[in-house]
Amino acid sequence: DAHKSEVAHRFKDLGEENFKALVLIAFAQYLQQCPFEDHVKLVNEVTEFAKTCVADESAENCDKSLHTLFGDKLCTVATLRETYGEMADCCAKQEPERNECFLQHKDDNPNLPRLVRPEVDVMCTAFHDNEETFLKKYLYEIARRHPYFYAPELLFFAKRYKAAFTECCQAADKAACLLPKLDELRDEGKASSAKQRLKCASLQKFGERAFKAWAVARLSQRFPKAEFAEVSKLVTDLTKVHTECCHGDLLECADDRADLAKYICENQDSISSKLKECCEKPLLEKSHCIAEVENDEMPADLPSLAADFVESKDVCKNYAEAKDVFLGMFLYEYARRHPDYSVVLLLRLAKTYETTLEKCCAAADPHECYAKVFDEFKPLVEEPQNLIKQNCELFEQLGEYKFQNALLVRYTKKVPQVSTPTLVEVSRNLGKVGSKCCKHPEAKRMPCAEDYLSVVLNQLCVLHEKTPVSDRVTKCCTESLVNRRPCFSALEVDETYVPKEFNAETFTFHADICTLSEKERQIKKQTALVELVKHKPKATKEQLKAVMDDFAAFVEKCCKADDKETCFAEEGKKLVAASQAALGL
């Protein structure tokens, strides 16, 4: 549909509240360093302009594209060059190059202070004093720290954030009510951000076809009763939504996501029997619910895949004449039969099938050549199964913290050039796969674990891309999206790495560690562990365990001491000396 004024169209579709929220998110995701007040001012100006266009679509500038309007507005920021440096050069470009330029300058790891949670009473007062500003600030702070956060989903988080304060600020024990809710929102928000970052990386680095293949596999697992044509339609629409959000077109994205939810609910009989509850909810909850809905039951008596994809005389002709359709059907049929497989495994199987057909179809006897193609799948299926089995056993034996430490050591030895904060963050998240997935029965373990690992390894890839330091990381991140995890799993100790010089300052601790939360204390210890491995990459597990046990005892002892600072200074020197001796430094 062509509209005279795109901005008026979106304002009317979304309503003023959502329009303003989405423009704020868009601006905060582009200009991540700008103060809150500046963004609010820009948003208000855009909103007032949109209202004039709603009143008269022929008014001056109302026919301009959203990129032109928003880009022009962002380029009015006076401090653009001093705050953002070369990003200011984007403003000299014309659309669509200007928007592409802004996108390229999005920073996955912006230099922003950590968000410190104020006292509950302080938060409740701020909420009551100015609810609108309080909620806008939430959107702003999340969006600028997570420049690829899925905007319509952030509206859903904001709605829950508001509900938590509305309920808990009236409760007898405000903290007991509010803090668990805020913790849950924080953890879910981080997970949501990381999942969306993978979708955007998939689209931007590997193209639309890679994303569509992922979507075909996932939706076929989720909606196994839906016809291929139905799944294809959903995939096309979902791809449009995510392409828009990843491209900064947040108004279009939110609008199209709402349309998709509406379509799914209107056609749930031909999609899934699990959608009924979701479809009774209001829009934001509905969209979220659909995105998280459990897999429908598989249809009974599905025929063998071999008939259409191995035995049929038309396999090669169908492949050659429309690879996208034929391989899409293969992926659909395989995925709907295998909710027990990870999406990335299904994509590997489809790639193997494609490679085999490409090799065999021009041969003298194509059928004889590809007849055993399904046998080639066996090792591909067994590899993640075995890996998950081994790692879940290790997790059950060690518990989450020590399992994270094992992964920290493993990954630091693989890619020791990567910065310590990145190794700690990524390994801690990799380690969470244990508590997240190992509790599941066999049939749910692989989709949980391997698809989660894809999300976490993507965090490593996007952080590493900003400042590349390891050819091995670059290789695993860029060669194949679906083989990232096997690529990292296959890395051995980097024998070319020259150990880091020993620096006593790295292992000097102070009394402030005693007041940290358990999580923060763990991070301090894990940071030290990474540094140890960087100094002594050939250290054995036993050596590292001994040093870390001594370190834990040292922290515990000094935190109980009367003069903590003196204890940390004196005992710290002894610990460093003992550790150096134990590791032969």
Partner: antibody, heavy 119, light 110 residues
Framework: EVQLLESGGGLVQPGGSLRLSCAVS????????INWVRQAPGKCLEWIGA?????TTFYATWAKGRFTISRDSTTVYLQMNSLRAEDTAVYYC???????????????WGQGTLVTVSS | DIVMTQSPSSVSASVGDRVTITCQSS???????LSWYQQKPGKAPKLLIY???KLTSGVPSRFKGSGSGTDFTLTISSLQPEDFATYYC???????????FGCGTKVEIK
């Protein structure tokens, strides 16, 4: 020595037909895909179609109907009907790299045969 | 419709120069099905690179292919006398029937 050798080109009137041959020596034709590609004077390369070892044929969208590819044990043929002035070109046969079926990787080419369509 | 755009259409360079030729495809090629050919006057094309970056055996390492999806590049790091020729890219798509070549880049002596 592995060789592809085209023949059958020449002058033909608009509306006429011509059959080009691609004689293959040094390799067993029953194991390879052979393509026909043409190049108008000073112009782009243009893929016409392919025949797989199994005899299955494929054509560029624009070539369907007027062009037919066939083979026997040592020769691949390109039958061209209803020829037009714009079909004037050098016609090449080329082998697809072994291990590929639909990719545009042609590692062995003939020397080409010139077809001129003119009244 | 498939469009394969090569640029520049011609380039004048000297021996030892670095030459870069680009090929843009709309839509994106299938699975990095992109090749580069070299053709000298009166001769058949010669396959240099396949799968966007793999060198055919016997092709000197000064030829380098890169890119993915829609944007591809052929780089000749240090032009030799025998490299003066016309270079074509070729793309494979979802349907074999859409196999398409670019219209060439002529590398001439300056």
């Amino acid at each position: 020595e592995v060789q592809l050798l085209e023949s059958g080109g020449g002058l033909v009137q608009p509306g006429g037909s011509l059959r080009l041959s691609c004689a293959v020596s040094g390799i067993d034709l029953s194991n390879y895909a052979i393509n026909w590609v043409r190049q108008a004077p000073g112009k782009c390369l243009e893929w016409i179609g392919a025949i797989w070892a199994s005899g299955t044929t494929f054509y560029a969208t624009w070539a369907k109907g007027r062009f037919t590819i066939s083979r026997d044990s040592t020769t691949v043929y390109l039958q061209m009907n209803s020829l037009r002035a714009e079909d004037t070109a050098v016609y090449y046969c080329a082998r697809t790299v072994p291990g590929y079926s639909t990719a545009p990787y042609f590692d062995l080419w003939g020397q080409g045969t010139l077809v001129t369509v003119s009244s | 419709d498939i469009v394969m755009t090569q640029s520049p259409s011609s380039v004048s360079a000297s021996v030892g120069d670095r030459v870069t030729i680009t090929c843009q495809s709309s839509p994106s090629v299938w699975s990095n099905f992109l090749s580069w050919y070299q053709q000298k006057p009166g001769k058949a094309p010669k396959l240099l690179i396949y799968e966007a970056s793999k060198l055919t055996s016997g092709v000197p390492s000064r030829f380098k292919g890169s890119g993915s999806g829609t944007d591809f590049t052929l780089t000749i790091s240090s032009l030799q006398p025998e490299d003066f020729a016309t270079y074509y890219c070729g793309g494979g798509y979802s349907s074999i029937s859409d196999t398409t070549f670019g219209c060439g880049t002529k590398v001439e002596i300056k």
